[in-house]
Amino acid sequence: EEELQVIQPDKSISVAAGESATLHCTVTSLIPVGPIQWFRGAGPGRELIYNQKEGHFPRVTTVSDLTKRNNMDFSIRISNITPADAGTYYCVKFRKGSPDHVEFKSGAGTELSVRAKPS
């Protein structure tokens, strides 16, 4: 079977401050089992934006129903965008592990730029 790919189709998007940003991400396989997480930035300094399994992420909603068994769409919508939200967002697939999940594969990233709110 072909190895799972994480696809972020948008290289960049631009959103006005105060609006919502939709960040698209799909995977090509249900295997390996494990959650998706979204990060802003890469490397050790990256910010956790959304974790499928734990935490409370009030500005983030998922575009699809992640509880559906065969779901492969892990796109998210971030509401009320501010200048501090600008950056590159990565959709990252983790392999289920104990006690911690292990990072398996990352998407190529989507750069979010924030425009000034139209007056």
């Epitope: 050790p44 910010e47 734990e54 409370h56 009030p58 500005r59 009320n80 501010t82 200048p83 709110k117």
Partner: antibody, heavy 119, light 108 residues
Framework: DVQLVESGGGVVRPGESLRLSCAAS????????MNWVRQAPGEGLEWVSR????????DYADSVKGRFTISRDNSKNTLYLQMNSLRAEDTAVYYC????????????WGLGALVTVSS | ETVLTQSPATLSVSPGERATLSCRAS??????LAWHQQKPGQAPRLLIY???NRATGIPDRFSGSGSGTDFTLTISSPQTEDSAVYYC??????????FGGGTKVEIK
């Protein structure tokens, strides 16, 4: 219930070091950015430092940059502030504060730890 | 850096008399403004976030309004237990996170 409990405060001489701890409970600690905020006697609130959920991203106020180091141990649900080369003007109550989400306000505060720097 | 200016520095009101506190930002912060209450000898407590949303457990006599650069915290009918210092906090531009200088509310 969310609880944040600081410890490690005390009286030190100028130039000495101190490490503050903040024990967190009642929420998924590893999913949230955390901050230190201080309050000098009779003064207002001053943000000191922030660390992202994974621990790899840190920010500091100019007044403490190069002297203070923020860190966290997600396996112990504990936040730290290592304070070196302490000055009289660092005398304050130090609060740890949880962020509502990564780019947001502080929704819970600890009770505070008093640090006194005096010769 | 965004500077937050609170006024008045001190506000003295009688119980039941409306209290209005102001916070002005040096540049727009959208609706990204919170209010915190700090009673003497206690830690701060979140009251209002996103300019107008009450935090969990906050009585409805507290309300927030405004957007852009001008914000208001209103205590519609202050109680003696509302004696405290009130701080605004912006989280539109950071770091650094900025707080206003505070308004001390005294209930006569």
């Amino acid at each position: 219930d969310v609880q944040l409990v600081e410890s490690g405060g005390g009286v030190v001489r100028p130039g000495e070091s101190l490490r503050l701890s903040c024990a967190a409970s009642g929420f998924s600690f590893r999913s949230y950015a955390m901050n230190w905020v201080r309050q000098a006697p009779g003064e207002g609130l001053e943000w000191v430092s922030r660390i992202n959920s994974g621990g790899g991203g840190t920010d500091y106020a100019d007044s403490v940059k190069g002297r203070f180091t923020i860190s966290r141990d997600n396996s112990k649900n504990t936040l730290y502030l290592q304070m070196n080369s302490l000055r009289a003007e660092d005398t304050a109550v130090y609060y740890c504060a949880k962020q509502y989400d990564w780019n947001s306000f502080f929704d819970y505060w600890g009770l505070g730890a008093l640090v006194t720097v005096s010769s | 850096e965004t500077v937050l200016t609170q006024s008045p520095a001190t506000l003295s009101v009688s119980p039941g008399e409306r209290a209005t506190l102001s916070c002005r930002a040096s540049q727009t912060v959208g609706s990204k403004l919170a209010w915190h209450q700090q009673k003497p000898g206690q830690a701060p407590r979140l009251l209002i976030y996103d300019a107008s949303n009450r935090a969990t457990g906050i009585p409805d006599r507290f309300s927030g309004s405004g957007s852009g650069t001008d914000f208001t915290l209103t205590i519609s009918s202050p109680q003696t237990e509302d004696s405290a210092v009130y701080y605004c906090q912006q989280y539109y531009y950071w770091p650094p996170y900025r707080f206003g200088g505070g308004t001390k509310v005294e209930i006569k």
